[in-house]
Amino acid sequence: QSPIFGPQDVSSIEGNSVSITCYYPDTSVNRHTRKYWCRQGANGYCATLISSNGYLSKEYSGRASLINFPENSTFVINIAHLTQEDTGSYKCGLGTTNRGLFFDVSLEVSQVPEFPNDTHVYTKDIGRTVTIECRFKEGNAHSKKSLCKKRGEACEVVIDSTEYVDPSYKDRAILFMKGTSRDIFYVNISHLIPSDAGLYVCQAGEGPSADKNNADLQVLEPEPELLYKDLRSSVTFECDLGREVANDAKYLCRKNKETCDVIINTLGKRDPAFEGRILLTPRDDNGRFSVLITGLRKEDAGHYQCGAHSSGLPQEGWPVQAWQLFVNEESTIPNSRSVVKGVTGGSVAIVCPYNPKESSSLKYWCHWEADENGRCPVLVGTQALVQEGYEGRLALFDQPGSGAYTVILNQLTTQDSGFYWCLTDGDSRWRTTIELQVAEATKKPDLEVTPQNATAVIGETFTISCHYPCKFYSQEKYWCKWSNDGCHILPSHDEGARQSSVSCDQSSQIVSMTLNPVKKEDEGWYWCGVKEGQVYGETTAIYVAVEERTRGSPHINPTDANARAKDAPEEEAMESSVREDENKANLDPRLFADEREIQNAGDQAQENRASGNAGSAGGQSGSSK
């Protein structure tokens, strides 16, 4: 008895695909050893066709794959574009040779079945409509017309011209003639179900003079498309159900034991397990739509089906499309925090991983919104203008070559709570979902700026100080000037760094920035922050208003972001003449529903490449006293 198990007999027809699962005992050795699929020859030799070591034979090139699922103790052999030559005896097995542990599998590939000359074959998918054509001679023009279904020797009437309809075809079958045609009638059967398949006979007239036609109806169940995705990556289900259901509600469901549970539909239903990581996007007016799921989990693996029905729920006899999703736990996508917590008035720094091979790709950050289908408007991107309402408090710091970029959001409010997506215009699998949870602050913020009322006068010297606690002593402190294309680091001076590293006076840890002389273009948002290398930490923001020397009225700040600062101790500061080149990219924030839409956004941004780079000091100069 072999400990390997699988299907002993697999049968299919030419042109189809098979997906053969082989089960092996759950041991560490088995999980990691070579898996193979070989064809048994007459001489007893089993010739390898594909193995987990990367070997692929010539006859399987471009049409087969072998995927190991160590967490399930299974491996799957997929073979597409079957021909009758694939019929034969095979082994699926484990081990360094093809004589190790194995299981015998018989594969039989048949021709598409042929029928007698007088039989018309109709092949339709589940849920579709078939129109059966029935020819008759002029002598039967006024005779009774009927369609019956063969059941053994009997032929049970489905519909006839006396308006009889079999109850199981009620509201699905109609018998009609077209125009002035005197030699043909038609029977439409809609909402086809698997049990409709079989041999039908249509008849005009009675007895020996009757005209009869045979029709073989094949109702095809959808072949599930096999999708292999990595843990934490994303998947897009492209659903094309045809024009006849263009106006019906659409859904994606996951097959459960008893039912197919709706994950999302166009009537606003959404499974809570997919909250924050799903989008349904209509593609066109012909009923095409796509469903994108990000942040794939192990438990997302399974059988999915999309369909259409006015109820937004699966109904027998309505068209469907099917997939089987496999989620590979050996993922190239790093594990990152799925929940980030912040407090009101504070800030968060969110690290977004991306494919390190695509460091030049455009990076984006969008806010998932729970409208009926889910949408994710872009808030910020490497070449995208920051969305209205996020000016001065949101920036994207690209760190080329590191395989990650950082998004910082400060001046947090409870309204910022929700789901956000990291995405690029490159590898679509690298989309991560983050849930931001913002709680009410219970203590004062770690970083505080003085003076609170930051109004600078043109031509004069203006200094702002940022107080930080001792816990940030060893971290790098920085000031940056926020603009639509990032927050550009400025020269600054750290007072705390002068002190002995042994003691830390909580009241005198200060990093300051001086504008000397103040210019009109210095007006805007400034951030004080801490970081360690490329790891960004806490930030706080202040708006610096600039006014003429003669003007007496104080400048009114655009937000209350400056209301938190305290008086600063005296300090010696570094002066910096700050210039800011604002090269704004004109990227409309868009709903990033799938690869194509992201690609479009990327193409648009490519035309507007900005020379400024978030996190760089380009365009600024500093001088020390």
């Epitope: 198990f5 299907p7 002993q8 007999d9 697999v10 049968s11 299919s12 027809i13 189809n16 695909s17 098979v18 997906s19 053969i20 089960y23 399930n72 589940i126 179900i193 698997p194 049990s195 095809l220 169940e221 959808p222 072949e223 599930p224 097959k255 459960n256 034991k257 008893e258 197919c260 399974g302 059988h303 089906q305 027998e316 469907v320 099917a322």
Partner: nanobody, 126 residues
Framework: EVQLVESGGGLVQAGDSLRLSCAAS????????VGWFRQAPGKEREFVTT??????????YYADSVKGRFTISRDNAKNTVYLQMNSLKPDDTAVYYC?????????????????WGQGTQVTVSS
């Protein structure tokens, strides 16, 4: 809900043949696994055979103890699955249950199946 009804059981001599039928009614799914399990008195329910299908592709799984003797097949138009049992042995005596599932991770595991028939008795005398 799917209802499963088994038929075809009975008393036969060792070496004889028997054909069991499992008729499904109610909600039908596009991808199915229908299997046969058996339970002898005082023993656990054991896997016999399963057929799964996807479109026009069929996969047939058998327990080692019945390989070469039992054959599973299906008639899609009749929503029926058959178990042809040849060369029956006294060890094959048991109540045979038909089971169905829409999602099967491992066809040998009874808990993977959601729908069960009432069972049909097969007795093989020596």
């Amino acid at each position: 809900e799917v209802q499963l009804v088994e038929s075809g059981g009975g008393l036969v001599q060792a070496g004889d043949s028997l054909r069991l039928s499992c008729a499904a009614s109610g909600r039908t799914f596009t991808t199915y696994g229908v299997g046969w399990f058996r339970q002898a008195p005082g023993k656990e329910r054991e896997f016999v055979t399963t057929i799964t299908w996807s479109g026009s592709t069929n996969y047939k799984y058998y327990a080692d103890s019945v390989k070469g003797r039992f054959t599973i097949s299906r008639d899609n138009a009749k929503n029926t699955v058959y178990l042809q049992m040849n060369s029956l042995k006294p060890d094959d005596t048991a109540v045979y249950y038909c089971a169905a599932s829409t999602v099967l991770t491992d066809p040998r595991v009874p808990t993977e199946y959601d729908y069960w028939g009432q069972g049909t008795q097969v007795t093989v005398s020596s």
